[in-house]
């Protein structure tokens, strides 16, 4: 059965300087491959967070993603700024064999609105 990626919130609003959580769950970890968060779509999309061990300032995972059966890939963005506004996508990849990972499923997206303090 094909993996499903669920982003339950269509949109969230957050005051500048506050934190917000973007929720994402998957129905399967197979095929093996990373899960990454992006802002925007297409060529201009920006990598926001990758669950592959790198450090991303202001962003951290919410659940224990070192659990071998973890299906929750939600993230918390701290100290939100107006530049963080946009639509965020949680994307499941299948690892590539000697080529780049292949995107196999994306969540429906969560729009982040940043409110002035």
């Amino acid at each position: 059965t094909e993996v499903k990626v669920t982003q339950p919130e269509k949109s969230v609003s957050v005051a500048a300087g506050d934190s917000t959580i973007l929720n994402c769950t998957v129905t399967s970890l197979l095929p093996v491959g990373p899960i990454r968060w992006y802002r925007g779509v297409g060529q201009s999309r920006l990598l926001i967070y990758s669950f592959t061990g790198e450090h991303f300032p202001r962003i951290r995972n919410v659940s224990d993603t070192t659990k071998r059966n973890n299906m929750d890939f939600s993230i918390r963005i701290s100290n939100v700024t107006p530049e963080d506004a946009g639509t965020y996508y949680c994307v499941k990849f299948q690892r590539g064999s000697s080529e780049p990972d292949t995107e196999i499923q994306s969540g429906g997206g969560t729009e982040v609105y940043v409110l002035a303090k």
């Epitope: 093996v32 592959t52 224990d64 070192t66 659990k67 690892r95």
Partner: antibody, heavy 117, light 108 residues
Framework: DVQLVESGGGVVRPGESLRLSCEAS????????MSWVRQAPGKGLEWVAG???????YYGDSVKGRLTISRDNSKNILYLQMNSLTAEDTAVYYC???????????WGLGTLVTVSS | SYELTQPPSVSVSPGQTARITCSGG??????YAWYQQKPGQAPVTVIH???KRPSDIPERFSGSSSGTTVTLTISGVQAEDEADYYC???????????FGGGTKLTVL
């Protein structure tokens, strides 16, 4: 620099117990999954057990029920409680740090456990 | 679970290319790594996540995969590369780590 230092090995009789420790430094221990891997004299590597940063545990088939992995994130120490030891448990025991996808990137020097009557 | 199969031994002359294969995993659910172990020493990770080389490992070590077979390639082998090499796998279906039986690399 990442450092993993095992201790607690020694000579015990069949049926006895032993607790191994692995002191970690040079990285954020509380954020990483960890494992124990053993190697019997003249033999290959065998995965024993793994533990997530939040202490979910996983075991190899040969040790289920007799060996217990645990951790103390406040002390940066990984443990392996070994009960009802048999001669087949004689090995060098290594602690290893897990990558995001549960392979191993850093290893300790190992501690030798000898079970003999 | 599954078994990973490696050749017991591989021999190569200095400066030549050594290739060590590992088969038996399911590419759909398994990630692979390669571990080097010299006599009396702890293992050292030379490749993880199929083809990722830790920063302190020489560039002559590389990993690749094709179907259910993964390969460790050592280009321009040096005498210091003589060691046992273990293929390791993590199976995302069973949550289990497995090792191959090891390959003894001899530098002639």
């Amino acid at each position: 620099d990442v450092q993993l230092v095992e201790s607690g090995g020694g000579v015990v009789r069949p049926g006895e117990s032993l607790r191994l420790s692995c002191e970690a430094s040079g990285f954020t221990f509380s954020s990483n999954a960890m494992s124990w891997v053993r190697q019997a004299p003249g033999k290959g590597l065998e995965w024993v057990a793994g533990i997530s940063s939040g202490s979910d545990t996983y075991y190899g088939d040969s040790v289920k029920g007799r060996l217990t992995i645990s951790r103390d994130n406040s002390k940066n120490i990984l443990y392996l409680q070994m009960n009802s030891l048999t001669a087949e448990d004689t090995a060098v025991y290594y602690c290893a740090r897990e990558t995001w996808n549960h392979l191993f990137d850093y290893w300790g020097l190992g501690t030798l456990v000898t079970v003999s009557s | 679970s599954y078994e990973l199969t490696q050749p017991p031994s591989v021999s190569v002359s200095p400066g030549q290319t050594a290739r060590i294969t590992c088969s038996g995993g399911d590419y759909y659910s398994t990630y692979y790594a390669w571990y080097q172990q010299k006599p009396g020493q702890a293992p050292v990770t030379v490749i993880h996540s199929d083809d990722k080389r830790p920063s302190d490992i020489p560039e002559r070590f590389s990993g690749s995969s094709s179907g259910t077979t993964v390969t460790l390639t050592i280009s321009g082998v040096q005498a210091e590369d003589e060691a046992d090499y273990y293929c390791g796998g993590y199976d995302g279906r069973t949550y289990i780590n497995t090792f191959g039986g090891g390959t003894k690399l001899t530098v002639l």
